[in-house]
C-alpha cells in the first residue's frame, strides 16, 4: 500500500496505490484511488512507467487521450471510465507481458488539487495445481500438474500424517516449456503414497504460491486448490 500526497497551491489530494502482480497473457489491473471529484471534466489521470518515454495511459476531459502513449501499451489499456468520478483511477492492462513489470506512477489532477503515488508491478505466470491419483504407476502415486508458471517455481510435497517429512527422495518434478517459450508446465509425481492420508503439493515462486490438496480414502478422493499472490497489497 502506497499513499502519495500532492500540493497544488494550498491544495493536495491523497492518491493510493497497491502493489500487484500480473499473469502473463492474461489481463491485469494496476490499482489506484484518489479523493473523488464530481467534476469529471476537471479530472486528469496519467499513468507513467519508469524508464519509458511517453505515457502508459491518459484520461482527461471525460475520455481517453492516447496521443502521448508509448507503443508498447497500444491497444492494451483502459481506465474504468464510469468509476473515475468516485475516485477510481485503476488501469486495466490487456495481455500482460513479462516486460510490463516495473515501477508505475499514478498521477491525478482534479479541481481540488493534484497528487501521485507509485506502485511496483510484478509479472510472471501462476496457475492452480491439480492433483490426481496416478493408477498407471507400479506403486500408487500422485501426480500434481499446473499448466503455467514463470519464473521457474519450487515444488514441495507435504503430508498430514507425516508432518515435517522430506518427500524429495520419493518425488520427481519436471518443467516443460510451453509453446510461447516463456511459461512452463509443472509436473510433480509423488510415489509410494498411503491411503487415508491428505497430501499437499505446494508450488511457489517470488510472485505466487499455490497449493493443491488431495485426500485419498478407500471410498473417495477429495481435492482442494488455492492460489495466493505474494507481497501484494
Amino acid at each position: 500500500l502506497i499513499i502519495g500526497f500532492g500540493i497544488s497551491g494550498k491544495h493536495f489530494i491523497t492518491v493510493t496505490t497497491f502493489t500487484s502482480a500480473g499473469n502473463i497473457g492474461e489481463d491485469g489491473t494496476l490499482s489506484c484511488t484518489f479523493e473523488p471529484d464530481i467534476k469529471l471534466n476537471g479530472i486528469v489521470i496519467q499513468w507513467l512507467k519508469e524508464g519509458i518515454k511517453g505515457l502508459v495511459h491518459e484520461f482527461k476531459e471525460g475520455k481517453d487521450d492516447l496521443s502521448q502513449q508509448h507503443e508498447m501499451f497500444r491497444g492494451r489499456t483502459a481506465v474504468f471510465a464510469d468509476q473515475v468520478v468516485v475516485g477510481n483511477a485503476s488501469l486495466r492492462l490487456k495481455n500482460v507481458q513479462l516486460t510490463d513489470a516495473g515501477t508505475y506512477t499514478c498521477y491525478i489532477r482534479t479541481s481540488k488539487g493534484k497528487g501521485n503515488a507509485n506502485l511496483e508491478y510484478k509479472t510472471g505466470a501462476f496457475s492452480m495445481p491439480e492433483i490426481n491419483v496416478d493408477y498407471n504407476a507400479s506403486s500408487e502415486s500422485l501426480r500434481c500438474e499446473a499448466p503455467r508458471w514463470f519464473p521457474q517455481p519450487t515444488v514441495a510435497w507435504a503430508s498430514q500424517v507425516d508432518q515435517g517429512a522430506n518427500f524429495s527422495e520419493v518425488s520427481n518434478t519436471s518443467f516443460e516449456l510451453n509453446s510461447e517459450n516463456v511459461t512452463m508446465k509443472v509436473v510433480s509425481v509423488l510415489y509410494n503414497v498411503t491411503i487415508n492420508n491428505t497430501y499437499s503439493c505446494m508450488i511457489e515462486n517470488d510472485i505466487a504460491k499455490a497449493t493443491g490438496d488431495i485426500k485419498v480414502t478407500d471410498s473417495e478422493v477429495k481435492r482442494r486448490s488455492q492460489l495466493q499472490l505474494l507481497n501484494s497489497g
Partner: antibody
Framework: QLQLQESGPGLVKPSETLSLTCTAS??????????WSWIRQHPGKGLEWIGN???????YYNPSLKSRVTMSVDTSKNQFSLKLSSVTAADTAVYYC?????????????WGRGTLVTVSS | DIQMTQSPSSVSASVGDRVTITCRAS??????LAWYQQKPGKAPKLLIY???SLQSGVPSRFSGSGSGTDFTLTISSLQPEDFATYYC?????????FGGGTKVEIK
C-alpha cells in the same frame, strides 16, 4: 450517429499505389476513445485486418503488409486514409474502414459499406 | 500470428433450429473474442464482444461463451434473417485475426 464511408478508385493497375479515404460523418474521429482500422476481404474469402490509426497519427500495421502500407489522418476533414503500394492482383478485395469499440476492446462496432478495389491492367 | 479456426465451415438448418458455431484460437486469448454476422454485399455486423457480451441492438437469441482457446456462438432459435456468414475475431494480440467463417444456409 456516426457513419463511415470509403472512397477511392475502384480500379488500380499492378505495381501502382492503392489510395482510399474514409470519411466520418455525424461524429468526430478526434474522440480519444477509439482507434480507426482498415480491414479487407478478398472475393468470396475471409477478413484480414490491415492496421489502425489514432487521431494523433500513431499507427500499427499488420506485419504481413507493413512494408507496403501507409495510413494517415486529417482531423480537419474528419478523414483517415490508406495507401497500399506495389499492388498485385492478390490485393483485389473489398476494403472496409471501421471503428474499434474502445481503446482496449479491439472489436469493430462500426463499419463503412466497403469499396471494391480491383487490381488489373 | 494467432490462428482462428472456425467449425463447421457451413451448416444447413431450418427456421427454429438451434445452431452452434465453434471457434478455436491457436493460443490463449482470455475472453478477447468477437463474433460478426455478414450478409452478401454488406459489411460485417458486430454481434458479441468479450466472448459473451451482447452488442446493443442484437437479439437475445444470439449468445456467446468460452475463454482461453475455445469459444462458441449459439443461435437459440434460428430466424429467416439469420441466414448469413458468421466470423469470429481475436482481439487479444496484434495483428488482430479472423476465423475463416461459417455459412449458415437454409436446409
Amino acid at each position: 450517429q456516426l457513419q463511415l464511408q470509403e472512397s477511392g478508385p475502384g480500379l488500380v493497375k499492378p505495381s501502382e499505389t492503392l489510395s482510399l479515404t474514409c470519411t466520418a460523418s455525424g461524429g468526430s474521429i478526434s474522440h480519444g476513445g477509439y482507434y480507426w482500422s482498415w480491414i479487407r476481404q478478398h472475393p468470396g474469402k475471409g477478413l484480414e485486418w490491415i492496421g489502425n490509426i489514432y487521431y494523433s497519427g500513431s499507427t500499427y500495421y499488420n506485419p504481413s503488409l507493413k512494408s507496403r502500407v501507409t495510413m494517415s489522418v486529417d482531423t480537419s476533414k474528419n478523414q483517415f486514409s490508406l495507401k497500399l503500394s506495389s499492388v498485385t492482383a492478390a490485393d483485389t478485395a473489398v476494403y472496409y474502414c471501421a471503428r474499434e469499440s474502445s481503446t482496449i476492446s479491439a472489436d469493430f462496432d462500426l463499419w463503412g459499406r466497403g469499396t471494391l478495389v480491383t487490381v488489373s491492367s | 500470428d494467432i490462428q482462428m479456426t472456425q467449425s463447421p465451415s457451413s451448416v444447413s438448418a431450418s427456421v427454429g433450429d438451434r445452431v452452434t458455431i465453434t471457434c478455436r484460437a491457436s493460443q490463449g486469448i482470455s475472453r478477447w473474442l468477437a463474433w460478426y454476422q455478414q450478409k452478401p454485399g454488406k459489411a460485417p455486423k458486430l454481434l458479441i464482444y468479450a466472448a459473451s457480451s451482447l452488442q446493443s441492438g442484437v437479439p437475445s437469441r444470439f449468445s456467446g461463451s468460452g475463454s482461453g482457446t475455445d469459444f462458441t456462438l449459439t443461435i437459440s432459435s434460428l430466424q429467416p434473417e439469420d441466414f448469413a456468414t458468421y466470423y469470429c475475431q481475436q482481439a487479444h494480440t496484434f495483428p488482430y485475426t479472423f476465423g475463416g467463417g461459417t455459412k449458415v444456409e437454409i436446409k
